[in-house]
Structure formats: structure tokens, C-alpha cells
């Protein structure tokens, strides 16, 4: 065994950057740090066989399987995949190790399987086996985190039943409103499942894995805040846990907090209290109301009261199934070419939605913002004044919602013309949709004022790609106008545009744009 070379097998995951995709070079892309695949000698195998740890790859990911051989002299090699031989070109690195690479660009099902690398060195022959499979993301889930009380401790545990196992973090903020945005300096993140510091202003728990990131905010009523005009509303599905935190600060300890549901005190075991002195020696109390698994009869007004603060309530609604409530009637807008404008959808939904805006088969990211009245709003402003059909699509675990918008841009018509042996056609996409006139230019009418009404056919057609309307007018050629110049004009409330066409015998047609 002394003759056996020292072998290292590594996996390099590449970040696809479009410029390199499709180029088959040894180093096609920006890469992550290499991952050691072990490469242990396989026992009870005929010949010397090394086996690398199994490799799981996402669909469309790009990777390099690489072997580093520390052996004297030259080496030759051959890759075999599904009984086909693949070219192998070893080279040497700065430490004089032999380097053999197999680049797999844009992983597909057909590229999954066993890759065998046969290496021949001056001293010995050996085989290295790589097993590459596609990661089954169909089994992946990312569930919204929920809270549990830690046994015998005043602490909350954050749980997200997701696959693969998510990274759980608490996102804490101690200031009000806008400054609690994710990237604000007021925000503190703790990558742990248990949280003991439960007195903060804003407490969220987030779970993230390959599918993304989901967060749940600890629903809080702050008795030191002026009562809101809109009663806060909390939706939950049957079986989910309910957590509401009531928080109050007072100059001394001489106050208590109580929770009631529909004017009945919560049962013991459905609440717990914590208190602490803040830096300025005021007393902070928090009282949690919780139900480990809600039923329909947990619906109602939950009121937190204090002897030293105005009472405040939240309406908790338990639903059997999630929902998305919004008006799905389509909406049409017309705006000027430089007018600022955003589409917006106001909706109430539970659980939180995932959404997209789509225009011309291209999807755009969708942001949603919570309003004070329990509704959320999503706006889309990035239309770049392109007329057409815009689609808002939202979904959650239980519901789907689609709303269509049409954007029309008010502008003067622009005319395009084309002609054949038998007819001349003009097209325009101005808005409002233009009307058409055709005029004949002749000795009698050098200014082209002689109107043509015979043989004219107007229509509007939907240019499907953008969902925008195009108006066209076609003039069927008659002997009376053959050989003459004709002028088609499109006009709307913003102006007129014309195009002049020479109706000669078949062949290339000269067009004279005339605005």
C-alpha cells in the first residue's frame, strides 16, 4: 500500500454567471470554495478503487468534480460515464500535483449517475468513483415559524417544520416603525432557537433554507401606545398556536396586566407574565396569552387591561382554511407618457401571500406592505410606460388570486405602412385608438385633399405580446387609384400622423412619412 498515491477528491460548486454558460472550459465560472469529498479506498473491491462521497446537485447547477493526485511522474486518465468514454486532460498545479477535472454545466437528469475516472500512473493503476444525483427539491418545504413556550422557563422557542432543516434566527428591534426595517442599525439578529429577552418592541422569528425565508412576528399590543383607530386583527387556522403579547411600562411596579377573551378571564395555563426594570428604573411588564392549538371557539376579542393604562383589544379570527380577499375585477388605466403612476392591489390574506407582477411573459418581484387596517398593499411602478396587460398573481397555502390591469399610454399616433399588389395597409398604436382617413394625391388635388371612402376597411387588433391594441386601415386597390400617391392619416385627440404611399405595380413601395 506504500505505492498508493495520496488522492484528494473535491466538488466545486459554481455560481452561474450568464456569460460563461455553455462554454466548456475547465474553469467556467465564479466558484465557491471546494468541498472535500473524502475519497476513501473501497474495501473488498477488485483492483484499487477510491469512492468519493455522494454528490447531490440542484437542477441547472454547474459543478466540477476534481481529483488531485500526489504521485511521482506523469499520469494518464479516462473518464467513463454510462458506458461512454470521455476525454480527460490532466494538468499539474503549483504543488506539482496531477489535477483531473470533470465540468458539468447546467445539471440535468441525464447527467446524473456514476462517473468513473481511471488513472494510470508510473507506479500503479486505480479507479475513482463519483456518484452524482439531482437533489429532490420536490420534497423540500419551508414552513412559517411558530412559537412555543420553553418548558419550566420564561422563554420562547421558535420552530419551523421545514426540509432541509432551516436556520432559525430571531430578529429584534427596539425602536418604532420605519427604523425596524430589516437592514436598519436598530435591528439585532440572533441565530438561535430559544429567546429569553422578550421585552423588546418588535420581535420576529425567521427560518431560512434553500427555498427562501419565512418570518412570523410576535403579535403585540403595547398599552403605552395610543389606541389605534383600527382594531388590530389576527388570523389563525384551526390547530395553529396563538400567541399575543401585551406590554406596558409604568413609573413603578404598582400595576398589573390581565387578559380577557370576550370579557372572561383567560384560564390559568393560557397566560404567563414577566417583568423587569428598564434602565431608567421604570417597570416593564409583559403578559402572554397563548393557546397551543386553536379551535373555532377561540375566536373573539382579546382584551389586555391594566390599572394604569387604557385597555386595548385585538380581534382574533380562527379560520378553517387560508384565504385571499381582494377585488379581482380587471382595471383599465390611461396615463400620459411622462405621468408617474403605480398599479396597486389592496388585499387581506392569511397566511401571508407570495406574489408576482407579470408583463409580456416577464415576471417582476412583488413587494407587499402591511397597512394599519389589517389590509396589505402591493404596488408596481416599474412599467416604464409600456402599454399593455399587467397581471398580479398571489397565492398562499390555501388560495390563489389573479387580477388583470390594462395600461394605456396617451400618445399621438405613429403610422407604419405596407403595400402589396392589391392593397395598401397602415398601422398605428396611438392611444386613444385613432380614426383613419385616406386621401388621393392627384393633379386636381396636389395637397392630397381628395378623400377616398370606397374600399377602405378599418379594424383594431390585439397585439398579443403586450396586450396592447393596434389599429389598422386597409385600402383595396382599384383602377381609379393605381399609380397614384395616396395618404393614410391616423388621428386622435393628441394629434395626427400620416404616411404617403405610391400605388404602383408590384414591387418595393416607397413610403413617405408625413407628420
Amino acid at each position: 500500500n506504500q505505492d498508493l498515491p495520496v488522492i484528494k477528491c473535491v466538488l466545486i460548486n459554481h455560481k452561474n454567471n450568464d456569460s460563461s454558460v455553455g462554454k466548456s472550459s475547465s474553469y467556467p465560472m465564479v466558484s465557491e470554495s471546494p468541498e472535500d469529498l473524502g475519497c476513501a479506498l473501497r474495501p473488498q473491491s477488485s483492483g484499487t478503487v477510491y469512492e468519493a462521497a455522494a454528490v447531490e446537485v440542484d437542477v441547472s447547477a454547474s459543478i466540477t468534480l476534481q481529483v488531485l493526485v500526489d504521485a511521482p511522474g506523469n499520469i494518464s486518465c479516462l473518464w467513463v460515464f454510462k458506458h461512454s468514454s470521455l476525454n480527460c486532460q490532466p494538468h499539474f498545479d503549483l504543488q506539482n500535483r496531477g489535477v483531473v477535472s470533470m465540468v458539468i454545466l447546467k445539471m440535468t437528469e441525464t447527467q446524473a449517475g456514476e462517473y468513473l475516472l481511471f488513472i494510470q500512473s508510473e507506479a500503479t493503476n486505480y479507479t475513482i468513483l463519483f456518484t452524482v444525483s439531482i437533489r429532490n427539491t420536490l420534497l423540500y418545504t419551508l414552513r412559517r415559524p411558530y412559537f412555543r413556550k420553553m418548558e419550566n422557563q420564561d422563554a420562547l422557542v421558535c420552530i419551523s417544520e421545514s426540509v432541509p432543516e432551516p436556520i432559525v434566527e430571531w430578529v429584534l428591534c427596539d425602536s418604532q416603525g420605519e427604523s425596524c426595517k430589516e437592514e436598519s442599525p436598530a435591528v439585532v439578529k440572533k441565530e438561535e432557537k430559544v429567546l429569553h429577552e422578550l421585552f423588546g418592541t418588535d420581535i420576529r422569528c425567521c427560518a431560512r433554507n434553500e427555498l427562501g425565508r419565512e418570518c412570523t412576528r410576535l403579535f403585540t399590543i403595547d398599552l403605552n401606545q395610543t389606541p389605534q383607530t383600527t382594531l388590530p386583527q389576527l388570523f389563525l387556522k384551526v390547530g395553529e398556536p396563538l400567541w399575543i403579547r401585551c406590554k406596558a411600562v409604568h413609573v413603578n411596579h404598582g400595576f398589573g396586566l390581565t387578559w380577557e377573551l370576550e370579557n372572561k378571564a383567560l384560564e390559568e395555563g393560557n397566560y404567563f407574565e414577566m417583568s423587569t426594570y428598564s434602565t431608567n428604573r421604570t417597570m416593564i411588564r409583559i403578559l402572554f396569552a397563548f393557546v397551543s392549538s386553536v379551535a373555532r371557539n377561540d375566536t373573539g376579542y382579546y382584551t389586555c387591561s391594566s390599572s394604569k393604562h387604557p385597555s386595548q383589544s385585538a380581534l382574533v379570527t380562527i379560520v378553517e382554511k387560508g384565504f385571499i380577499n381582494a377585488t379581482n375585477s380587471s382595471e383599465d388605466y390611461e396615463i400620459d407618457q411622462y405621468e408617474e403612476f403605480c398599479f396597486s392591489v389592496r388585499f387581506k390574506a392569511y397566511p401571508q401571500i407570495r406574489c408576482t407582477w407579470t408583463f409580456s411573459r416577464k415576471s417582476f418581484p412583488c413587494e407587499q406592505k402591511g397597512l394599519d387596517n389589517g389590509y396589505s398593499i402591493s404596488k408596481f411602478c416599474n412599467h416604464k410606460h409600456q402599454p399593455g396587460e399587467y397581471i398580479f398573481h398571489a397565492e398562499n397555502d390555501d388560495a390563489q388570486f389573479t387580477k388583470m390591469f390594462t395600461l394605456n399610454i396617451r400618445r399621438k399616433p405613429q403610422v407604419l405602412a405596407e403595400a402589396s399588389a392589391s392593397q395598401a395597409s397602415c398601422f398605428s398604436d396611438g392611444y386613444p385608438l385613432p380614426s383613419w382617413t385616406w386621401k388621393k394625391c392627384s393633379d386636381k388635388s396636389p395637397n392630397c385633399t381628395e378623400e377616398i371612402t370606397e374600399g377602405v376597411w378599418n379594424r383594431k387588433a390585439n397585439r398579443k405580446v403586450f396586450g396592447q391594441w393596434v389599429s389598422s386601415s386597409t385600402l383595396n386597390m382599384s383602377e381609379a387609384i393605381k399609380g397614384f400617391l395616396v395618404k393614410c392619416c391616423a388621428y386622435n385627440s393628441l394629434g395626427t400622423s400620416c404616411e404617403t404611399i405610391l400605388l404602383n405595380s408590384p414591387g418595393p413601395f416607397p413610403f413617405i412619412q408625413d407628420n
Partner: nanobody, 111 residues
Framework: QVQLQESGGGLVQAGGSLRLSCAAS????????IDWYRQAPGKQREWVAQ???????FYADSVKGRFAISRDNAKNTVYLQMNSLKPEDTAVYYC?????WGQGTQVTVSS
């Protein structure tokens, strides 16, 4: 069906007084707290005062010492006694019980 009805609004000179009433029906009145809010023209609705079911009262800083809230459970009514009124107290006054609102009563204080 819960219904709240405000009354007692009107036009009054600065320094004068008014007493607003909020009568409730369709609800076990005595076990709930009631809030008064107001909305001045072109402004957001703002909280003014609250009376709890134990008759504890709380006030916004802008009305503390001038307004007094009380309740009569037998009549299912809450009152807002407004003294030393100022022009900036001009608004529509609403009472609220949980998610339920009255229609409002107009109070105008002239200088």
C-alpha cells in the same frame, strides 16, 4: 346588532362647555370599555379618552384636566363632559366599543 349613537354636539364659544352622550344597544354594555375619538377636518382620527368597565378613566394629553368621561350602566350610556373648550377641539366626536363605531357628532368651537 351592536349600535352606538352619539349626541350632544353643537356650536359653542371658546371657553364654553358641552356634554356628549354615547348610547349603546345590542350589547352587554357594563362589561366593556368605551373609547371616545375625534376627527378634525383634514386630520387623522385621534383617541381622546377611555372609560373601563371599572370606571377607570384615561385621557389624551391634549384634553387632560379639561374633559371628564363617565358612564351610567343602567342607561347603557357613556358621557364626555368637555370644559374650557378651545378652537382646536373642533371635530367630529365618535364613540367606539371594540370594532363598533357610532356615526359621530359635530363639535364646533368658535373663537
Amino acid at each position: 346588532q351592536v349600535q352606538l349613537q352619539e349626541s350632544g354636539g353643537g356650536l359653542v364659544q371658546a371657553g364654553g362647555s358641552l356634554r356628549l352622550s354615547c348610547a349603546a344597544s345590542g350589547v352587554t354594555f357594563s362589561i366593556n370599555y368605551i373609547d371616545w375619538y375625534r376627527q378634525a377636518p383634514g386630520k387623522q382620527r385621534e383617541w381622546v379618552a377611555q372609560i373601563t368597565r371599572d370606571s377607570n378613566s384615561f385621557y389624551a394629553d391634549s384634553v387632560k384636566g379639561r374633559f371628564a368621561i363617565s358612564r351610567d350602566n343602567a342607561k347603557n350610556t357613556v358621557y364626555l363632559q368637555m370644559n374650557s373648550l378651545k378652537p382646536e377641539d373642533t371635530a367630529v366626536y365618535y364613540c367606539r366599543l371594540l370594532s363598533y363605531w357610532g356615526q359621530g357628532t359635530q363639535v364646533t368651537v368658535s373663537s
